[in-house]
Each structure stands twice: as structure tokens, then as C-alpha cells.
Amino acid sequence: AMHVAQPAVVLASSRGIASFVCEYASPGKATEVRVTVLRQADSQVTEVCAATYMMGNELTFLDDSICTGTSSGNQVNLTIQGLRAMDTGLYICKVELMYPPPYYLGIGNGTQIYVIDPEPCPDSDF
């Protein structure tokens, strides 16, 4: 499978937003690429979001997706929003070169995203 690189650890912002780069080494001249973010907890793998894009065009996730992203060459900048402490876990970038053949697939080692819920603001008496 293709080599896919992603950072080992990312800390989500206080607003529950985490961003990381997923970079792949393309063996060929793909025109259609599919990027999927998977969350792995123990032996369970769930799909967080997915997008297919044409090389040179923007990455488009579904309207209700918690992910957004941009692409540049063999690099995809992914942002996951709405994260809470319970969403802390390993997020894996999966890249598939869909067209033209041959089909190639690559799996990153995963990015451990840490999410810390913000402390509620104490009531202030002025």
C-alpha cells in the first residue's frame, strides 16, 4: 500500500477543533482521490468523514460532515470540528487513488487527537 504520513499527536483547540496534514506518496498519476478519516478505538474502526476530489480541485465533504479540508498536490489539510473530551482517540488517514487504474490504497499510522473540554466559566458578580 502507499505510504501515508500524518502527525503522531495533535491537541484540539479549546473550541474542539483539531487540524492535521495527511500526506501520501503517489505511485502514479491519479486524477481522482478519496480521503477518509477513520477513528480506531481498540478493535473498532468507525468512519468519521470522507471526501473524493479531483486533483487540482478542492476537497469537498458533505454539508453535514464534521470535517473540512483543502488539498495541495499529494497533501491534504484536514480539520475536524465539534470534538469533545470523549472523542479523544486515534484518527487514521486513509487515502485511495480511485482513478485511473491501478487502484492504490494507503493507511497512515494515525494521529492521536487529545480533546480537553473547557472548564465552565465561574459566575462573576460585579
Epitope: 506518496a25 487502484y103 493507511i107
Partner: antibody, heavy 115, light 108 residues
């Protein structure tokens, strides 16, 4: 039209060597990782090995059953992949297929190892 | 190495039946799985790539599903020309890209 044509098969004695060739046409050979897959008579498919392409430094991988005896190489200028088989054993008797990626398959060439 | 276990090893079904073949991986393979069809005396042909994607020219009665470790090939309405042996294959690095043992499909 995509074509993969294997050649070089035949009858060989145990311990001897044989080189198979896979000539490709109809697709961009240099974009493809080339694989060899074999099938013993009446048995299932067995992945033999793989050679990746230039962006992957022509890395090679082999199944444990052939490691150290078989070598895969390629010539992108001629669109040919090779399988060099040394120290052949009777259990290497099979139809050998080459594949481009895993999308395109040749028709196979038969290798019989027997004394 | 990751092992691929296919079941059943053979099955017999009637024309029009829904046929399901399963393939299990000994570890998570993230959908890195292909399915092939091999008709008697012929070379294998790619049917499904990446667990769910239908290869070019393959009839829509074939479909693939699954993720993680468990995968399924379904023929929604078996046709006489579907008589063949079907194989799954793990395509996740590092190699070996192991095949399942195969499932022989026959018509009753």
C-alpha cells in the same frame, strides 16, 4: 487494450533455474506495482511477490515460501517484469500470473518442476 | 502475517438466489481488501477493490461490504455465468498480500 503476456514457463528439474517474463501493453507500465501470483494444480491463489515503481525506489517484497530463491525485477523502458526462480522445488509447480497493480492479469504461464 | 479466512469453501445455489461469501482478517485491515472471480480455466478477474468499489465492467448484482476485519461479497441474483471460484485478498502494507482460500460457487 490492456495486455499482460507471461512467457518462459516450461518443464524444469528440481534445483534448476527459470526466468519468467511479463510483457505489458495498453497501460502506463511505470505507474504500476507489478505482482506475481501463482496457482498450483487444483489449488487456490498464492501471492508470490511484488516490485514497486520508481517513486517507491523499486522496492521488492516476497512471500516466505519463495524468499531467498526468487527475484523480481522490471525494465520500465521495455514494459517488462521478470521473475527469476532459482533452486526450484517440486512444490513450485504452478501456473504463474503477473498482475499490474492487482487490476490487470495476464493469462498465465505453466511451470512444472519434476525430475 | 495477517491471515485471511474465507467461508464457505464451496456452495451450491439456484439461479436468482442471493449468495453471500465472507472473508475475515486476523487483524484490522481498514477496508484494504479486493475480491476476484476466477472462472474454470481462466485468469482471475478483479471484481471489487477497496472492499466496496465495483471494478469496471462488473455487473451491479455484485457488491462488497465490510470494514475492520469482516468483509462480505454478495451476488444479489445468481446467474449461470457466475459459476466460478471467488477469492478475497488483503492489500494492506506490509506485504504479503495474502489471499483467502477461495469459495467455489456452483448452480443447483
Amino acid at each position: 487494450e490492456v495486455q499482460l503476456v507471461e512467457s518462459g514457463g516450461g518443464l524444469v528439474q528440481p534445483g534448476r533455474s527459470l526466468r519468467l517474463s511479463c510483457t505489458a501493453s495498453g497501460f502506463t507500465f511505470s505507474d504500476n506495482w507489478m505482482n506475481w501470483v501463482r496457482q498450483a494444480p487444483g489449488k487456490g491463489l498464492e501471492w508470490v511477490g511484488q516490485i514497486r515503481n520508481k517513486p517507491y525506489n523499486y522496492e521488492t517484497y516476497y512471500s516466505d515460501s519463495v524468499k531467498g530463491r526468487f527475484t523480481i525485477s522490471r525494465d520500465d523502458s521495455k514494459s517488462i517484469a521478470y521473475l527469476q526462480m532459482n533452486s526450484l522445488k517440486t512444490e513450485d509447480t504452478a501456473v504463474y500470473y503477473c498482475t499490474g497493480g492487482m487490476d490487470y492479469w495476464g493469462q498465465g504461464t505453466t511451470v512444472t518442476v519434476s525430475s | 502475517d495477517i491471515q485471511m479466512t474465507q467461508s464457505p469453501s464451496s456452495l451450491s445455489a439456484s439461479v436468482g438466489d442471493r449468495v453471500t461469501i465472507t472473508c475475515g482478517a486476523s487483524e484490522i485491515i481498514y477496508g484494504a481488501l479486493n475480491w476476484y472471480q476466477q472462472k474454470p480455466g481462466k485468469s482471475p478477474k478483479l471484481l471489487i477493490y477497496g472492499a466496496t468499489n465495483l471494478a469496471d465492467g462488473v455487473p451491479s448484482r455484485f457488491s462488497g461490504s465490510g470494514s475492520g476485519t469482516d468483509f462480505t461479497l454478495t451476488i444479489s441474483s445468481l446467474q449461470p455465468e457466475d459459476v466460478a471460484t471467488y477469492y478475497c485478498q488483503k492489500i494492506l502494507s506490509p506485504p504479503p498480500w495474502t489471499f483467502g482460500g477461495g469459495t467455489k460457487v456452483e448452480i443447483k
